[in-house]
Interface confidence: low
């Protein structure tokens, strides 16, 4: 037969197997003109692999317990006898009433996604039923699985889970929602409440619309031997051996111990559903015993031991050990010492491994000792305290507290501003502006250690040098930086901050704030020389405080202009001299001028300029200060707020008196006036005062 290339490409040529597993066919290739020699196409047939599922595919689980999946429940095999390690189950839809987990892996981890038949055989795949808050009699859950083992086709499987109080449960001897027993001090009475005995799960077997018409009837089949049961203060006896769930729920059942010893007591009962008007109805029932523990009223109470705070990072989980919660009680087993959460913090909750995912409010010392109790931190970063009550069931409950510290994953030292030290004081308190630690919140309990000290000073607390201090001391203004060496206008030091077990370092810069009064006033005229005097720069207060004459050193500027010393009188030889250093006395003597230049290379107009000065005085650190001023082209009609020693050349020409005065002519009579000279009478007054004097 002839087949074309296009038929092959189109997948239209099929091979149908029959007979032996090995075989094939011969073929030749031809393009119509040329024919190739013969070829053999070998075909090896493989037996088809089929997957099959055996086992009941149903699992019966006791309420609140963990049950392994077994080969009776789930048993996969393949026609090729595949290794169980290669038979893989994928969980398509997980359980709704519990969870599936691997015994060898963290039972608190994520939901199980896949597992092998070998793990089922080993009993490592566990279903855990989580107790719901509401009572139930029977509940059904399903797991949807997909079995795969290439090259076989996948097989879908459904595992049905029945959770029932009907089942005989070694882990849970009672078929009731609660049958915890009771403790009672010798010779005393105790109420039996639904916290100790509760058959509301029997009621849950009735459809909810009819539930209110039903009750559970308890029939006492064997009475307590050392005490008496009372319902609404009426004793139960052989002639009246019944009480109801509704009476239990209303707190009407009481056990009164008769005294004379601390032997165990209890009663046996049968519980079954009761229909409307007391009619007996078909439904779940159980026969059980209720244990009553009689305690010696003089027994020694448990002694709580000192507790170490639990520390963990937010969002994590940490086990609670005896370091956090333990008691000394020679006459109680760990399982008898019960804790109840009175108040929980907002930063997380307590959980029991195997006790469901939610928070627990009751647990025992045995839970702590076995490592089953853990704290689960939520996203909150605040510390918190559990207030607990602890009882051995005989003594009055005792208060205990469990502190939980949430550790930050990282902290940051915030430096909002350098520390400014007033020049005359030479010392200043640190504040939150300089040092403040934040993580995901403020850390008011941060501690600091000096890892690189300042060069020119000390850090002091209480007047004494220190290398360690706290945020609290900073906030109280107790941490002081003091200059000890008066040679620098700045300093720095490095600290290591520690908050809740995490550290970070930071550098604090220290600068000296000059004790200098600076008044630049309005704009200053370009091309003019103005007088620098205490109306512009004044370190008089520093002079008084240090009993010395403060000195200025010009560090920088002005960019357009210069500071000059002006001659005392016309007779004094020479013009103005460039100045780099001057004193407060020079300012007070009116010996200094500032030649305000014009910015070059651009059209005339307003501009800005500044002087940077270093101010020195005896016994205090130097400080850097700046005098910032605005300039504008000279305006003859404008009153300027400083004394002008000269005005621009052009302005004098306009006034009709060319060459009347040198640019830095001597100060006239007005120069000593504390008020600005030009401002007094405008331009003509200035000319009168300065040119015709």
């Amino acid at each position: 037969r002839t087949r074309s290339g296009s038929q092959l490409d189109g997948g239209l040529v099929l091979f149908s197997h029959r007979g032996t597993l090995d075989g094939g066919f011969r073929f030749r290739l031809s393009d119509g003109e040329h024919t190739s020699p013969g070829h053999f196409f070998r075909v090896t047939a493989q037996k088809q692999v089929l997957l099959s599922l055996k086992g009941s595919q149903t699992l019966t689980v006791c309420p609140g317990s963990v049950q392994p999946l077994s080969s009776q429940t789930l048993r996969a095999s393949s026609s090729a006898g595949t290794d169980p390690q290669l038979l893989l189950y994928r969980v398509v839809r997980g359980p709704q009433l519990g969870r599936l987990f691997h015994a060898q892996q963290d039972s608190t981890g994520e939901a199980l996604v896949n597992f092998t038949q070998a793990e089922v055989y080993a009993g490592n795949i566990l279903y855990e039923h989580e107790m719901p808050p509401e009572p139930f009699w029977e509940a059904h859950d399903t797991l949807e699985l997909q079995l795969s083992s290439p090259p076989a086709r996948d097989v879908a499987a459904t595992l049905a889970v029945a959770v029932s109080f009907e089942a005989a449960c070694p882990q849970r001897p009672s078929h009731l929602w609660k049958n915890k027993g009771l403790w009672v001090p010798e010779g005393q009475r105790a109420r039996i409440t639904v916290a100790a005995l509760d058959a509301s799960n029997l009621l849950a077997s009735v459809p909810s619309p009819q539930r209110s018409e039903h009750d559970v009837l308890f029939q006492v089949t064997q009475f307590p031997s050392r005490g008496q049961l009372l319902v609404s203060e009426e004793p139960l006896h052989a002639g009246q051996p019944h009480f109801l769930q509704s009476q239990l729920a209303a707190g009407q059942l009481v056990y009164a111990h008769g005294g004379g010893g601390t032997q165990q007591d209890g009663f046996h009962f049968r519980a079954h559903l009761q229909g409307p008007a007391g009619a007996s109805v078909a439904g779940p029932q159980t026969s059980e015993a209720f244990a009553i523990t009689v305690r010696d009223v003089n027994e020694r109470p448990p002694q709580p031991q000192a507790s170490v705070p639990l520390r963990l990072t937010r969002g994590s989980r940490a086990p609670i050990s005896r370091a956090q919660l333990s008691v000394v009680d020679p006459d109680s087993a760990p399982g008898e010492i019960e804790y109840e959460v009175q108040r929980a913090p907002h930063n997380g909750f307590l959980s029991l491994v195997g006790g469901g995912l939610g928070p627990v409010t009751r647990f025992t010392q045995a839970d702590v000792d076995s490592g089953r109790l853990a704290f689960v931190a939520n996203g909150s970063s605040v510390a918190g305290i559990f207030q607990l009550s602890m009882s051995d069931g005989a003594s009055p409950p005792l208060p205990m507290s469990l502190a939980v510290d949430i550790l930050p994953s990282a902290i940051e030292v915030q430096l909002r501003a350098p520390l400014e030290v007033p020049q005359a004081l030479g010392r200043s308190s640190l504040s939150q502006q300089q040092l403040r630690v934040v993580s995901d919140r403020e850390e008011p309990e941060a501690a600091y250690r000096l890892i690189q000290g300042p060069q020119y000073g000390h850090l002091l607390v209480g007047g004494r040098p220190t290398s360690a201090f706290s945020q609290f001391q900073i906030d109280q203004g107790e941490v002081v930086f003091a200059f000890t060496n008066s040679s620098s206008s700045h300093d720095h030091f490095r600290v290591l901050a520690l908050a809740r077990g995490v550290n970070a370092s930071a550098v604090v810069n220290v600068t000296v704030r000059a004790l200098l009064h600076v008044w630049a006033g309005g704009p200053w005229p370009q091309g003019a020389t103005l007088r620098l005097d205490p109306t512009v720069l004044d370190a008089g207060e520093l002079a008084n405080r240090t009993d010395s004459v403060p000195r200025f050193r010009l560090l920088e500027g002005p960019r357009h202009g210069r500071v000059v010393r002006v001659p005392r009188a016309r007779t004094e030889p020479g013009g103005s001299q460039l100045v780099e250093q001057f004193t407060q006395q020079d300012l007070e003597d009116g010996r200094l001028g500032l030649e305000v230049g014009r910015p070059e290379g651009r059209a005339p107009g307003p501009a800005g300029d500044s002087l940077t000065l270093e101010l020195w005085a005896q016994g205090v650190p130097p400080a850097v200060a700046s005098l910032d001023f605005a300039t504008e082209p000279y305006n003859a009609a404008r009153p300027y707020s400083v004394a002008l020693l000269s005005v621009p050349e052009a302005a004098r020409t306009e006034a009709g008196k060319p060459e009347s005065s040198t640019p830095t002519g001597e100060p006239g009579p007005m120069a000593s006036s504390p008020e600005p000279a030009v401002a007094k009478g405008g331009f003509l007054s200035f000319l009168e005062a300065n040119m015709f004097s």
Epitope: P304, R343, A344, T361, L398
Partner: antibody, heavy 117, light 113 residues
């Protein structure tokens, strides 16, 4: 029976510190919290904080944080409350009270502290 | 902080009658985990320390006469004193013991005519 006996009245200058004691008897000292509550003349009750005599753990009201220190001496079943940087508004009767967690079942007789210059 | 507000500030009642004092908290003091209201009532007579009457909103402290009863849930609570006796003349305080700082109401002065 349960007894909490407090130290006697004190007069203090502003800025000074005071230390009031509270001696417990008639019960197991380490099993119950001791709280401090104060009452200014003619005013209501104000909770200051608690100490767990067993562990020494404390919890102070924010208002007194940094000024109050509560300590205990288990050998003498005594709790102490120290308040520093006193101001005139700290003039009050200071009570110690025993509790199971958070309500105050037994109280000391009270200690009047007067802050005056 | 939880703010406790009592009403009235004072009341005068004749012997043998009933007195009712109200207390309101700025947030619920019901602990949903154990369904208990963390509220206590105290009685204080001049020159004496306060005396515990009621805790958990309605549980009477042992030795307290059953004329005293507490009720309420969440944020609204009432102390009721039936058949008033002359010795009931005192100031009554409510206190939340749900969360620190534990806070008291401003007090209600009860006078017997």
């Amino acid at each position: 029976q349960v007894q909490l006996v407090q130290s006697g009245a004190e007069v203090k200058r502003p800025g000074a510190s005071m230390k009031v004691s509270c001696k417990a008897s008639g019960y197991t000292f380490t099993n119950y919290y001791i709280h401090w509550v104060r009452q200014a003349p003619g005013q209501g009750l104000e909770w200051m904080g608690w100490i767990n005599p067993n562990s020494g753990a404390t919890n102070y009201a924010q208002k007194f944080q940094g000024r109050v220190t509560m300590t205990r001496d288990t050998s003498t079943s005594t709790v102490y409350m120290e308040l520093s940087s006193l101001r005139s508004e700290d003039t009050a009767v200071y009570y110690c009270a025993k509790s199971w967690v958070s309500w105050f079942a037994s109280w000391g007789q009270g200690t009047l502290v007067t802050v005056s210059s | 902080d939880i703010v406790m507000t009592q009403s009235p500030d004072s009341l005068t009642v004749s012997p043998g009658e009933r007195a009712t004092i109200n207390c309101k908290s700025s947030q619920s003091v019901l602990n949903s985990k154990n369904n208990r209201n963390y509220l206590a009532w105290y009685q204080q007579k001049p020159g004496q320390p306060p005396k515990l009457l009621i805790y958990w909103a309605s549980t009477r402290e042992s030795g307290v006469p059953d004329r005293f009863s507490g009720s309420g849930s969440g944020t609204d609570f009432t102390l009721t004193i039936d058949s008033l006796q002359p010795e009931d003349s005192a100031t009554y305080y409510c206190q939340q013991h749900y969360s620190t700082p534990f806070t008291f109401g401003q007090g209600t002065r009860l006078e017997i005519k």
